[in-house]
């Protein structure tokens, strides 16, 4: 890391250091020989995270309704407002700029990860021993029925689509 | 009462590396920055860099960049300084020095030492 | 880097007199300067910073001047106990730096 001219929390500004605005407020004016910085609140709506010598605060994100996306953790002067989405919708971005609906497992798969605000379904494609018959984005993949437990014989093999069918044993003298 | 007590004298070859420890009691540690400075025989003040206790945080002067390393155990009030590839003229004493409180400085970095340990005499000679 | 040069190299008084060692820097430090003594085999002590606040414990016969480039440092009536080398440090920006020193030895 190279040498720096000042303190942590100091920029160099006219071949001097100056304190740093902390988090949550903008620069004003820089110090002078006899004068510390000058900083001032970010207003409401802005925020700024880091110490800084930002004239302007950032504005607080916008969490758009018609985007699917509704306000998680609202912001402060400190801190960015944080956008999450509509139950049954998922960001499409680390930042969650905007929202996508969950993805439903087809069938033949079932969910191995139920979605969140900020990750979509994971599917996963049924084994051989399970199957599944419908399009979700919950369900997860089923066992097929054991005819055995249920004195009955498979008639018809399942796949991972479909349940195996079972019929009665043919009782053979 | 403040008091910085640096370890003892080190006799090292050409190209070895020195790690000398200072131990600060009577005030808060992680308050002030921690400087270093050398004093080569017969010669003036050197600056070497500085270490700032809270977050760990290190400043070095251009000429130890890549050869020196300062760090620091809060649990027991330490700060140490690692000298690599050893020459004969880094042959000094090097001490330790407190700056002033953080949070005092506005303008300017105003690193003045009040308090100073004692010295520790680093000797590289074959 | 900002470089201090500091003048004379040493000088030779007797108790009693008045002593004043000037430093330059190569750029502007505002009146980000401190004054040390340092005795032989003792680390140095501070005597005064932001170029004419005296440092506490410090006796009032030493005084600093100065701001920008041109600094001064003035022991008013040498002691005996003042003989010793003195340096200027500026405290502008990193990388401090000192001067060469000035030494104060009995006429």
């Known amino acids: 890391e190279p040498p720096t001219a000042c303190r942590e929390k100091q920029y160099l500004i006219n071949s001097q250091c100056c304190s740093l605005c902390q988090p949550g407020q903008k620069l004003v004016s820089d110090c002078t020989e006899f004068t510390e910085t000058e900083c001032l609140p970010c207003g409401e709506s802005e925020f700024l995270d880091t110490w800084n010598r930002e004239t302007h605060c950032h504005q607080h994100k916008y969490c758009d309704p018609n985007l699917g996306l509704r306000v998680q953790q609202k912001g402060t002067s400190e801190t960015d407002t944080i956008c999450t989405c509509e139950e049954g919708w998922h960001c499409t971005s680390e930042a969650c700029e905007s929202c996508v609906l969950h993805r439903s497992c087809s069938p033949g798969f079932g969910v191995k990860q139920i979605a969140t605000g900020v990750s979509d379904t994971i599917c996963e494609p049924c084994p051989v021993g399970f199957f599944s018959n419908v399009s979700s984005a919950f369900e997860k993949c089923h066992p097929w029925t054991s005819c055995e437990t249920k004195d009955l014989v498979v008639q018809q093999a399942g796949t991972n689509k479909t349940d195996v069918v079972c019929g009665p044993q043919d009782r053979l003298r | 009462q403040v008091q910085l007590v640096q370890s003892g004298a080190e006799v090292k070859k050409p190209g070895a590396s020195v790690k000398v420890s200072c131990k600060a009691s009577?005030?808060?540690?992680?308050?002030?920055?921690m400087h270093w400075v050398r004093q080569a025989p017969g010669q003036g003040l050197e600056w070497m860099g500085w270490?700032?206790?809270?977050?760990?945080?290190?400043n070095y002067a251009q000429k130890f960049q890549g050869r020196v390393t300062m760090t620091r155990d809060t649990s027991i009030s330490t700060a140490y300084m690692e000298l690599n590839r050893l020459r004969s003229d880094d042959t000094a004493v090097y001490y330790c020095a407190r700056d002033q409180p953080l949070g005092y400085c506005t303008n300017g970095v105003c690193s003045y030492f009040d308090y100073w340990g004692q010295g520790t005499l680093v000797t590289v000679s074959s | 880097d900002i470089q201090m040069t500091q003048s004379p190299s040493s000088v030779s008084a007797s108790v009693g007199d008045r002593v004043t060692i000037t430093c330059r820097a190569s750029q502007g430090i505002y009146s980000w300067l401190a004054w040390y003594q340092q005795k032989p085999g003792k680390a140095p002590n501070l005597l005064i910073y932001?170029?004419?606040t005296l440092q506490s414990g410090v006796p009032s016969r030493f005084s600093g001047s100065g701001s920008g480039t041109d600094f001064t440092l003035t022991i008013s009536s040498l002691q005996p106990e003042d003989f010793a080398t003195y340096y200027c440090?500026?405290?502008?920006?990193?990388?401090?730096?000192f001067g060469g020193g000035t030494k104060v030895q009995i006429k």
């Open positions: 270490i700032n206790p809270d977050s760990g945080g290190t």
């Open positions: 009577g005030y808060t540690f992680t308050g002030y920055y």
């Open positions: 932001t170029a004419s």
């Open positions: 440090q500026q405290a502008n920006i990193f990388p401090l730096t």
